[in-house]
């Protein structure tokens, strides 16, 4: 899915109002020094691509994130604010339902959620490029469409 035409500000608002708090709840009890953020993103559509991948794609050692509250709210936000997103996710949802029986919090899942928090931080702020190049807010000017 191409996240270029999402309403980034609406997704950011959804993240800050609820999703961020759910991620913190998931990570509660984890030392803040435990994980190094190794996954990065270069602009807002790219950040959403990485966020979708880490949130919904099963990985070795962590197959259960998609049923978490933050994942369901992320899916809802993308469905509402990214035109055509839900249609692309129908097959993926069927596969998810078959694959996941129960929620298990492993160290690998905690690490993955820590990576997610880092990706969302990058999504939420202007891109750190030196003067003369565009930042996230210029991306907004070019690609930001309102969908109601």
């Amino acid at each position: 899915y191409d996240f270029t035409n999402c309403d980034f500000e609406k997704i950011k608002a959804a993240y800050l109002s609820t999703i961020s708090k759910d991620l913190i709840t998931y990570m509660s009890g984890t030392k803040s020094t435990e994980f190094n953020n190794t996954v990065s993103c270069s602009n807002r559509p790219h950040c959403l691509t990485e966020i979708q991948s880490l949130t919904f794609n099963p990985t070795a050692g962590c197959a259960s994130l998609a049923k978490e509250m933050f994942a369901m709210k992320t899916k809802a936000a993308l469905a509402i604010w990214c035109p055509g997103y839900s249609e692309t996710q129908i097959n993926a949802t069927q596969a998810m339902k078959k694959a996941r029986k129960s929620k298990v919090t492993t160290n690998k899942c905690l690490e993955q959620v820590s990576q997610l928090q880092g990706l969302w931080r990058r999504f939420n702020r202007p891109l750190l490029k030196q003067q003369g190049s565009s930042d996230y807010k210029d991306d907004d000017d070019k690609h930001h469409h309102h969908h109601h």
Partner: antibody, heavy 119, light 107 residues
Framework: EVQLVQSGAEVKKPGSSVKVSCKAS????????IEWVRQAPGQGLEWMGV????????NYNENFKGRVTITADKSTSTAYMELSSLRSEDTAVYYC????????????WGQGTTVTVSS | DIVMTQSPDSLAVSLGERATINCKAS??????VTWYQQKPGQSPKLLIY???NHYTGVPDRFSGSGSGTDFTLTISSLQAEDVAVYYC?????????FGQGTKLEIK
């Protein structure tokens, strides 16, 4: 608990440079941006620039016309701000601050470093 | 650069009364506004992020509102410990910029 501890007060001559350090503890240093803000005596806050310690990316306030350089050393969890071609109006308290968990604010601040520029 | 202009520059309010500080951006900053409190001789402290979200441990008497270019910080019932200078900051576009500050005192 995250802590940012800055280097001590400096007295500098006009035209010289100053390098202020900011050592972070209690969190993963490379995961969060570090910004630098200064405050002249009796004045407001002025944003100087920011660094991503994870990859070294920076963004500077162009008002400083290339006089400011921000760096980070991941091995010691320390950020540095160097200001060159000092003048008397650079006399200020210099603060470092760390990005919060959401990427929309700076929640932990250093204690400040007083830099006095005087001949 | 985006200019953030606060009003008033200083404000005197009686204990228990409401204090309101305004911040106007020279262009839209969406909801990317943060409020900081700075007491004499101390570093700034984060109060409110993304217009209206309370930072951990910030009392409920502090609230933020607004969007686009006009923002407000409200203290519903002023306490003695709220005497400080308050700054808004836009987090929408580099360079990040602060308002000039509003000094809040007790009447």
């Amino acid at each position: 608990e995250v802590q940012l501890v800055q280097s001590g007060a400096e007295v500098k001559k006009p035209g010289s440079s100053v390098k202020v350090s900011c050592k972070a503890s209690g969190g993963t240093f490379s995961n969060y941006l570090i910004e630098w803000v200064r405050q002249a005596p009796g004045q407001g806050l002025e944003w100087m620039g920011v660094i991503d310690p994870g990859n070294g990316d920076t963004n500077y306030n162009e008002n400083f016309k290339g006089r400011v350089t921000i760096t980070a050393d991941k091995s010691t969890s320390t950020a540095y701000m160097e200001l060159s071609s000092l003048r008397s109006e650079d006399t200020a308290v210099y603060y470092c601050a760390r990005e919060d968990n959401t990427g929309t604010a700076f929640d932990y601040w250093g204690q400040g470093t007083t830099v006095t520029v005087s001949s | 650069d985006i200019v953030m202009t606060q009003s008033p520059d200083s404000l005197a309010v009686s204990l228990g009364e409401r204090a309101t500080i305004n911040c106007k951006a020279s262009q839209s900053v969406s909801s990317d506004v943060t409020w900081y409190q700075q007491k004499p001789g101390q570093s700034p402290k984060l109060l409110i992020y993304y217009v209206s979200n309370h930072y951990t441990g910030v009392p409920d008497r502090f609230s933020g509102s607004g969007s686009g270019t006009d923002f407000t910080l409200t203290i519903s019932s002023l306490q003695a410990e709220d005497v400080a200078v308050y700054y808004c900051q836009q987090h929408h576009r580099f360079p990040l910029t602060f308002g000039q500050g509003t000094k809040l005192e007790i009447k």
